[in-house]
Interface confidence: medium
């Protein structure tokens, strides 16, 4: 089969060569070729060139359209991993480490606390918080995780909240909270996660993470 293909290729190449040679002879005005033949060959050649040029233009248009489409609606996604912090703040700390995602500069992790978006739109925002607590060692209040929003010029808002009672297991019982929802974000808006007791949060691989995805 390969040999037959090779012969076919060589035959086509030879035909192309003859065709090009004929055009050359037409251009130099060789008497052995009739005017009619030359006109036919020339128009055939022009047709080929036109086709090539049109294809090129179409490809260019398609590419530029793809680029425009890409520019207008780039993928925006982030997934960050929890980071233990010595600070007493109730806002959880995150890091671009391990198997994290930061699609481009249209979403950034600021101060290790908040995911900030540059484009307006609908975003699916989620957080998983795993914590280890004990009923006796903790206060009566449940462990609460909140997904919060800070828009420029606006005060912080709680978007989602979940509460879990403390475990009776000793020294502590692991529990996970998952928060997730779709929200309209303005350019410059930041989302962050707040918990009642950051010292109880589990920072082992895969336990606590936070992210968003532009829809």
């Amino acid at each position: 089969h390969r040999r037959l293909d090779k012969i076919e290729d060589e035959r086509n190449l030879h035909e192309d060569f003859v065709f090009m040679k004929t055009i050359q002879r037409c251009n130099t005005g060789e008497r052995s070729l009739s005017l009619l033949n030359c006109e036919e060959i020339k128009s055939q050649f022009e047709g080929f060139v036109k086709d090539i040029m049109l294809n090129k233009e179409e490809t260019k248009k398609e590419n530029s359209f793809e680029m425009q489409k890409g520019d207008q609606n780039p993928q925006i996604a982030a997934h960050v991993i929890s980071e233990a912090s010595s600070k007493t703040t109730s806002v959880l700390q995150w890091a671009e480490k391990g198997y994290y995602t930061m699609s481009n500069n249209l979403v950034t992790l600021e101060n290790g606390k908040q995911l900030t978006v540059k484009r307006q739109g609908l975003y699916y925002i989620y957080a998983q918080v795993t914590f280890c607590s004990n009923r006796e060692a903790s206060s009566q209040a449940p462990f609460i995780a909140s997904l919060c929003l800070k828009s420029p010029g606006r005060f912080e808002r709680i978007l989602l909240r979940a509460a879990n009672t403390h475990s009776s297991a000793k020294p502590c019982g692991q529990q996970s909270i998952h928060l997730g929802g779709v929200f309209e974000l303005q350019p410059g808006a930041s989302v962050f996660v707040n918990v009642t007791d950051p010292s109880q949060v589990s920072h082992g691989t895969g336990f606590t993470s936070f992210g968003l995805l532009k829809l």
Epitope: T89, K150, S151, P152
Partner: nanobody, 119 residues
Framework: EVQLLESGGGLVQPGGSLRLSCAAS????????MGWVRQAPGKGLEWVST????????YYADSVKGRFTISRDNSKNTLYLQMNSLRAEDTAVYYC????????????WGQGTLVTVSS
Amino acid sequence: EVQLLESGGGLVQPGGSLRLSCAASGFTFSQYDMGWVRQAPGKGLEWVSTISSRGWLTYYADSVKGRFTISRDNSKNTLYLQMNSLRAEDTAVYYCAKGPGGRRRFDYWGQGTLVTVSS
């Protein structure tokens, strides 16, 4: 009428500490981002720090990161700036500012309090 009154400035040696306070009145303090801005002698205004309305988010200029801590007490309508490891270049008039939004945008300023870091 919005009023911001700073206090706590003074003369301190390099490496020393100071705590500035800002008493706010005339607006719902707990609903606004607040911040500190400073002006060194013969220089322009420099943003120092901002804290969000509930106090959950804080922002700092690179020049003060790790040395200064901004905080607020919404029950007392008071803003604070704890300044540690002070340097000569921190010498400036420190202004308390109320923000309509954005961490470096403010619409009201106090009269300022002078902090001088010198041996």
